[in-house]
């Protein structure tokens, strides 16, 4: 999937965690098919 950023964001961010995607893990691998 693709995400485009660089437009105004209306998502609220926690002040304690970065809103960037966490490091990839194999648990996030998409199912084949």
């Amino acid at each position: 999937s693709e995400t485009t950023t660089g437009t105004s964001s209306n998502s609220s961010q926690s002040t304690s965690n970065s809103g960037l995607a966490p490091n990839p893990t194999n648990a996030t691998t998409k199912a084949a098919g």
Partner: antibody, heavy 118, light 107 residues
Framework: QVQLVQSGAEVKKPGASVKVSCKAS????????MNWVRQAPGQGLEWMGE????????TFNQKFKSRVTMTRDTSISTAYMELSRLRSDDTAVYYC???????????WGQGTTVTVSS | DIQLTQSPSFLSASVGDRVTITCRAS??????LAWYQQKPGKAPKLLIY???TLHSGIPSRFRGSGSGTEFTLTISSLQPEDFATYYC?????????FGQGTKLEIK
């Protein structure tokens, strides 16, 4: 040790495309997002986007969305960035950089100079 | 997008001086600010992340502080190898953005 080694300098005509490679070594390539950042001559740093090496999910800067293609080949631990419909103002050094969630862009490639000239 | 404004843009100093560079964000980025050093013809090098954490191998004369919208990078005693351009970068949200840079020159 972590190393990111990029492909060599390119000279392109306006309207053409360029594809830059970034070969990673010294760490698990699939464990970190690969980012692309460019720097025009005498200018600052501009983030283009990133790719998740496992899922191939991408996040782009809106400015580049319509012209940039990011891919990867996990079998050879290499990421690619292709920029199409080149213009003279795309003349820049293009960097790949590993992004760690905690530390941000912690390791960078040496840069690839792309010159767009007729 | 979050705008980052660095000040000053240019800074002249001497070896042994203490210098401070400021980075202001257009909205709160919590602690998620990184600092990079770049020398001519070279890639940027990470110095500090999460506002104040020194990256591995970076000398302790580099110190980052701040949170929210105002951050500072302090070099306690300038060494000859410290003359370079410094960039701040927020890693709180997409799109990742950088400050315009501060060029540190020898006086």
């Amino acid at each position: 040790q972590v190393q990111l080694v990029q492909s060599g300098a390119e000279v392109k005509k306006p309207g053409a495309s360029v594809k830059v490679s970034c070969k990673a070594s010294g760490y698990d390539f699939t464990g970190y997002h690969m980012n692309w950042v460019r720097q025009a001559p005498g200018q600052g740093l501009e983030w283009m986007g990133e790719i998740n090496p496992i899922t191939s999910d991408k996040t782009f800067n809106q400015k580049f969305k319509s012209r940039v293609t990011m891919t990867r080949d996990t079998s050879i631990s290499t990421a690619y960035m292709e920029l199409s419909r080149l213009r003279s103002d795309d003349t820049a050094v293009y960097y790949c950089a590993r992004r760690d969630y905690g530390t941000s862009l912690d390791y960078w490639g040496q840069g690839t100079t792309v010159t767009v000239s007729s | 997008d979050i705008q980052l404004t660095q000040s000053p843009s240019f800074l002249s100093a001497s070896v042994g001086d203490r210098v401070t560079i400021t980075c202001r964000a257009s909205k709160s980025i919590s602690k998620y600010l990184a600092w990079y050093q770049q020398k001519p013809g070279k890639a940027p090098k990470l110095l500090i992340y999460a506002g104040s954490t020194l990256h591995s191998g970076i000398p302790s004369r580099f110190r980052g502080s701040g949170s929210g919208t105002e951050f500072t990078l302090t070099i306690s005693s300038l060494q000859p190898e410290d003359f370079a351009t410094y960039y701040c970068q927020q890693h709180n949200e997409y799109p990742i953005t950088f400050g315009q840079g501060t060029k540190l020159e020898i006086k």
